[in-house]
């Protein structure tokens, strides 16, 4: 059916399929050192890895995409590993009037799927 | 800032960057011929193309991903082209009690971005 269960075991071997991984980055890496004051080092969870057929399919569209990629690999790309949800992060940053604490909802990935 | 505008002009040339493309598929292609009765051929809009630096960034996370990919291409993948929204599609399909019309909200892409 259109809502077949996404496959959850990686056929490529441990750590090869779409998963969450933490990348350490400084404000300098991000080009943010001129406006963000804290934290000065971020633990950035990102989605990495491959999306073999039906692995962690985001939705029906991703399942279709996986199927058509198998039939027409030159025309239809394989699904790719992207965030399914995010963790909010508080940044202390400059404002015109001084310093502010602001929560960013779309900065750090919390979960991943294949879309 | 964290909310810099995503770039919208493709530096790789026409049709190379992330965009919506229509792929024609039969029920047989999708493996749905045993349960879907109509339509027998679907015009499936899908997201294809590359995501060069800051092109159509989905959000702050995608902007960070693009930046870190430039710094650590072996560790951080480039953003990839995925649906930003979907168009509902009505399928006529078999049920235990006969035939039913059902709307699928996540089947056909309507817009694309780089995530």
């Amino acid at each position: 059916s259109a809502h077949a269960h996404p496959r959850d075991s990686c056929p490529l071997g441990p750590g090869r399929c779409c998963h969450l991984e933490t990348v350490q980055a400084t404000l300098e890496d991000l080009g943010w050192s001129d406006w963000v004051l804290s934290p000065r080092q971020l633990q950035l969870s990102m989605c990495v890895g491959e999306c073999p057929h039906l692995y962690r399919s985001a939705n029906t569209h991703a399942q279709i995409k996986a199927r058509l990629h198998g039939l027409q690999p030159d025309k239809v790309p394989a699904p790719c590993c992207v965030p399914s949800s995010y963790t909010p992060v508080v940044l202390m940053h400059r404002t015109d009037s001084g310093v502010s604490l602001q929560t960013y909802d779309d900065l750090v990935a919390r979960g991943c799927h294949c879309a | 800032s964290a909310h810099a505008h995503p770039r919208d002009s493709c530096p790789l040339g026409p049709g190379r960057c992330c965009h919506l493309e229509t792929v024609q598929a039969t029920l047989e292609d999708l493996g749905w011929s045993d349960w879907v009765l109509s339509p027998r051929q679907l015009q499936l809009s899908m997201c294809v193309g590359e995501c060069p630096h800051l092109y159509r960034s989905a959000n702050t996370h995608a902007q960070i991903k693009a930046r870190l990919h430039g710094l650590q291409p072996d560790k951080v993948p480039a953003p990839c082209c995925v649906p930003s929204s979907y168009t509902p599609v009505v399928l006529m399909h078999r049920t235990d009690s006969g035939v039913s019309l059902q709307t699928y909200d996540d089947l056909v892409a309507r817009g694309c971005h780089c995530a």
Partner: antibody, heavy 119, light 112 residues
């Protein structure tokens, strides 16, 4: 509003492991992306930062205590914990949990819990 | 580790009068971004510390404007323009430029 509450045994024997838990109420420990720290205060003395944990589970420790400290988080229980091994009388202190942005701006503190190390 | 030194150790004050506490660091707390990474905390008797000032001179939410922080590099000052009875307690400065963050020894403010 968000509140922090420390809990754990008030008396620990020398050479044993001190274990404390900080329960976050009024908000989720995994939302907000704050750093969750442990800070202690020896009787009648100043404050000492022990370490912190962030949303990703990544930990930061004071080098002077690093070999004995473990901080962990349990998002399902909305708690983070401190374990300090091989304690001596010098570890007798009031232990506070606190929420900060990185290891600064500790705008939210627990009420503190006194832990005495004695046989 | 960065060493923080506060003075005086004890400060008797008269309500309505100004008060000033000094904090010195063993190395500069001025970041290349132009901000001084120094917090001030007040610990009232029998309570947990509370944040007063962050990044050298920024008042924390809900802190009365009689409190102000100043200074740069290695020398910092917390001023109370008009002391009130509720301001008694131990004041701590804390450097946050480098891990581990370190606190000053504290200044005890009490009413004369």
């Amino acid at each position: 509003q968000v509140q922090l509450q420390e809990s754990g045994p008030g008396l620990v024997k020398p050479s044993q492991t001190l274990s404390l838990t900080c329960t976050v109420s009024g908000g989720s420990i995994s939302s907000g992306g704050y750093y969750w720290s442990w800070i202690r205060q020896h009787p009648g003395k100043g404050l000492e930062w022990i370490g912190a944990i962030v949303y990703s589970g990544h930990t930061y420790y004071n080098p002077s205590l690093k070999s004995r400290v473990t901080i962990s988080v349990d998002t399902s229980k909305n708690q983070f914990s401190l374990k300090l091994s091989s304690v001596t009388a010098a570890d007798t202190a009031v232990y506070y949990c606190a929420r900060g942005v990185e290891y600064q701006h500790f705008s939210l503190w627990g009420q503190g819990t006194l832990v005495t190390v004695s046989s | 580790d960065i060493v923080m030194t506060q003075s005086p150790l004890s400060l008797p004050v008269t309500p309505g009068e100004p008060a000033s506490i000094s904090c010195r660091s063993s190395q500069s707390l001025l970041h290349s971004n132009g901000y001084n990474y120094l917090d001030w905390y007040l610990q009232k008797p029998g309570q947990s510390p509370q944040l007063l000032i962050y990044l050298g001179s920024n008042r924390a939410s809900g802190v009365p404007d009689r409190f102000s922080g100043s200074g740069s590099g290695t020398d910092f000052t917390l001023k109370i323009s008009r002391v009130e009875a509720e301001d008694v307690g131990v004041y701590y400065c804390m450097q946050t430029l480098e891990a581990p963050p370190t606190f000053g020894g504290g200044t005890k403010v009490e009413i004369k």
